[in-house]
């Protein structure tokens, strides 16, 4: 019983750490903001789910459109 309780608590802790399952856990969608005006060249890197570093979020969004891909933002900062 004690072992089962510890196991359940551990499982709950793991679930809370991992967050939601599905797309949310992979990353968030990049926003183009003002797509018609393009993106500035300000270097504020984000790491894509493809393992590539993008100069900023807007650039990732643009590349997704131009390349017809669906790369998400894995984390802020370089990969």
């Amino acid at each position: 019983m004690k072992v089962t309780g510890i196991f359940l608590l551990s499982a709950l802790a793991l679930l809370s750490l991992s967050g939601n399952t599905g797309a949310d856990s992979l990353g968030r969608e990049a926003k183009c903001y003002n797509e018609l005006n393009g993106c500035t060249k300000i270097y504020d890197p984000v790491c894509g789910t493809d393992g590539n570093t993008y100069p900023n979020e807007c650039v990732l969004c643009f590349e997704n459109r131009k390349r017809q891909t669906s790369i998400l933002i894995q984390k802020s900062g370089p990969c």
């Epitope: 393009g38 060249k41 570093t53 100069p55 590349e63």
Partner: antibody, heavy 118, light 110 residues
Framework: QSVKESEGGLFKPTDTLTLTCTVS????????VSWVRQAPGNGLEWIGI???????DYASWAKSRSTITRNTNLNTVTLKMTSLTAADTATYFC?????????????WGPGTLVTVSS | AYDMTQTPASVSAAVGGTVTIKCQAS??????LNWYQQKPGQPPKRLIY???TLASGVSSRFKGSGSGTQFTLTISGVECADAATYYC????????????FGGGTEVVVK
Amino acid sequence: QSVKESEGGLFKPTDTLTLTCTVSGFSLSIYGVSWVRQAPGNGLEWIGIIYASGSADYASWAKSRSTITRNTNLNTVTLKMTSLTAADTATYFCAREDDTYGYTSSIWGPGTLVTVSS
Amino acid sequence: AYDMTQTPASVSAAVGGTVTIKCQASQSISSYLNWYQQKPGQPPKRLIYRASTLASGVSSRFKGSGSGTQFTLTISGVECADAATYYCQQDYSSNNIDNTFGGGTEVVVK
């Protein structure tokens, strides 16, 4: 800010072409670079692009025999094209995208002539 | 495929006249269209981007318009220096593309 293609020259059919675009005054981690060619007396033909992320896209006709890579430390972008034929005879240009992302080819190199002949 | 069709292939204009070049995309490219001018032995020079925005240092005699699939480059008050070949280029997609450029229009100034 500038881009310049390496020397072209004379190649034989089936040879592999390697051209280098040397860039100065900007970072390849922030700017994408395209390759475009122009056969004598013909129009402009897009070959492909390497984006700021390092991902590359190619024209459908070039995909199977072209590779575009970059070296951000050396400030170079390289085009490799295999299985050359006489139809690949052209002036090859590299071009950098604009300061506003999404609008390519604002800065062009002078071009380099590649001749394929037996 | 985003194929670009440019018309006419060649046009003749008198000094001071007006030239109109059309570019049609096979599917909508929003406003992602560039216009270039190329003279023999030189690389292309970008005139207009985002369909209607004049590139830095380009004369206001050049005007771009259109969106979606239909675009126009108008050269007013044509000068001898405008004799060149003009190309449109879609900048919307790089995926599964044959060529981002139109076939070109040669402008001859009389």
